[in-house]
């Protein structure tokens, strides 16, 4: 029960931070005009990852999208590069985890499928909750280095008879959505790898028994669907996620709970 | 159509206060900004602050801050522009203008203007 | 504040002649954000309350008459009148839109000979 309790929070949590990562990927308020000891304009600005837009006083809002690739910043393009993969990984991750959830019954699936599918997930959630606070913060830090120097203009380049109204950016709504998102993402994948101790069926002494069908032969091992599908994980993975590192064939030969893990 | 309606002639003494009305019509008063302007004869004209009817947000020029006092009532669709301790300088027309939507923080409709003469 | 300068101050012209009258800001005006320039044209007729001619430093308001034209980015901003008319006589004011305060230039008073 509590597993279950355990899987179907950490489906939920990563489900909120994904649609999160989305929201934020999405939004135009990356970064904000400075308000603060600025002289006040009468116009807003604030940009996204796709599109700048600026507001009126009258609340007219006018957005244009950056309809280059490359003229771009390179951090930029990273950001946006950080973010898809993060929504991708966790789309996929959330796909696998839907079949994965103890509660839902797929013909015959074993729990070791389960098991496995749901470490999957929780990997992918992982990934992408991370991927989600890297764009963010390398964002939030791409905002942090300009506003010092956009700062020490203001102070310096007062020598010419023109002066420009320097627009400096802060951080917007959408990097603290983001960071939220990937840390929900993040905690739902954890959750996610904690479930998945649970779901694998108890230690059997014996070994994997090959029952034969006719015409062709389909082998069925206890514990042995980490070799059969793309689910499992191979032994590097092991290695992360168990405590001692054996191979293949101790682990196929003397399945316990913990490979699963 | 859109019309700003401002109150009559003033002729006050020096020290005292005087409140300028502004009555619109013509459309919704609360989702526009109301702007005032001052003009003394024969000279340019000067922008004294603004008041967004809808949340009573206001903003003003430095050198009106403690002269001028705007506030609006949404109930008549009115803005209001109080003037205190006038001295002879604070002799001029006022003009009350609506904030066009989507015109570049322009004013698009104008009224007629208040004269105020301060005068012992 | 931003400062608003108009030359000239004062202009006398034949109807149908062309005339340009220029307006100079302190800051630029220009926001990247949407690469637009907040400056707005007035045209004041004696007596009158002032009329909203030109925002954005070139957009026309509707029912403007074609002949007037803005033009201008960051600091410089001109104001064109094709072919004058008698009922061009005013006063031809430019305000800084873009900061608080907004800031109106002198004017240039437009007579017609």
């Known amino acids: 029960m509590a597993v279950t309790a355990c899987q179907g929070l950490g489906f939920v949590v990563s489900l909120i931070g994904i649609a999160g990562i989305i929201a934020a990927t999405c939004m135009d308020q990356w970064s904000t005009q400075d308000l603060y000891n600025n002289p006040v304009t009468a116009v807003f600005n604030y940009q996204g990852l796709w599109r700048s837009c600026v507001r009126e006083s009258s609340g007219f809002t006018e957005c244009r999208g950056y309809f280059t690739l490359l003229g771009l910043p390179a951090m930029l393009q990273a950001v946006r590069a950080l973010m898809i993969v993060g929504i991708v990984l966790g789309a996929i991750g959330l796909l696998v985890s839907i079949f994965a959830l103890k509660c839902i019954r797929i013909g015959s699936m074993e729990d070791s499928a389960k098991a496995n599918m749901t470490l999957t997930s929780g990997i992918m959630f992982i990934v992408s909750g991370l991927c989600a606070i890297a764009g963010v913060s390398v964002f939030a830090n791409m905002l942090v280095t300009n506003f010092w120097m956009s700062t020490a203009n203001m102070y310096t380049g007062m020598g010419g008879m023109v002066q420009t109204v320097q627009t400096r950016y802060t951080f917007g709504a959408a990097l603290f959505v983001g960071w939220v998102a990937g840390g929900l993402t993040l905690i739902g994948g954890v959750m996610m790898c904690i479930a998945c101790r649970g779901l694998a069926p108890e230690e059997t002494n014996y070994k994997a028994v090959s029952y034969h069908a006719s015409g062709h032969s389909v082998a069925y091992k206890p514990g042995g669907f980490k070799a059969s599908t793309g689910f499992g994980s191979n032994t590097k993975n092991k290695k992360i996620y168990d405590g001692g590192a054996r191979t293949e064939d101790e682990v196929q030969s003397y399945p316990s709970k913990h490979d699963y893990v | 159509q859109v019309q700003l309606k401002q109150s009559g002639a003033e002729l006050v003494r020096p020290g005292a206060s005087v409140k300028l009305s502004c009555k619109t019509s013509g459309y919704t008063f609360t989702t526009f900004w109301i702007h005032w302007i001052k003009q003394r004869s024969g000279q340019g004209l000067e922008w004294i602050a603004k008041?967004?009817?809808?949340?009573?947000?206001?903003y003003y020029n430095e050198k009106f801050k403690g002269k001028a006092t705007l506030t609006a009532d949404k109930s008549s669709s009115a803005a209001y522009m109080q003037l205190s301790s006038l001295k002879s300088e604070d002799s001029a027309v006022y003009f009350c203008a609506r904030e066009g939507y989507g015109k570049g923080n322009a004013v698009d409709f104008w009224g007629q203007g208040s004269s105020v003469t301060v005068s012992s | 504040d931003i400062v608003m300068t108009q030359s000239p101050s004062s202009l006398t012209v034949t109807a149908g002649e062309k005339v340009t009258m220029s307006c100079k800001s302190s800051q630029s005006l220009f926001n990247s954000g949407n690469q637009k320039n907040y400056l707005t044209w007035y045209q004041q007729k004696p007596g009158q309350p002032p009329k909203l001619l030109i925002y954005?430093?070139?957009t026309r308001e509707s029912g403007v008459p074609d002949r007037f034209t803005g033009s201008g980015s960051g600091t410089d901003f001109t104001l064109t009148i094709d072919s004058v008319q008698a009922e061009d006589l005013a006063v031809y004011y430019c305000?800084?839109?873009?900061?608080?305060?907004?800031?109106f230039g002198g004017g240039t008073n437009l007579e017609i000979k």
């Open positions: 008041i967004y009817p809808g949340t009573g947000y206001t």
């Open positions: 954005w430093a070139s």
């Open positions: 305000q800084n839109d873009y900061t608080y305060p907004s800031t």
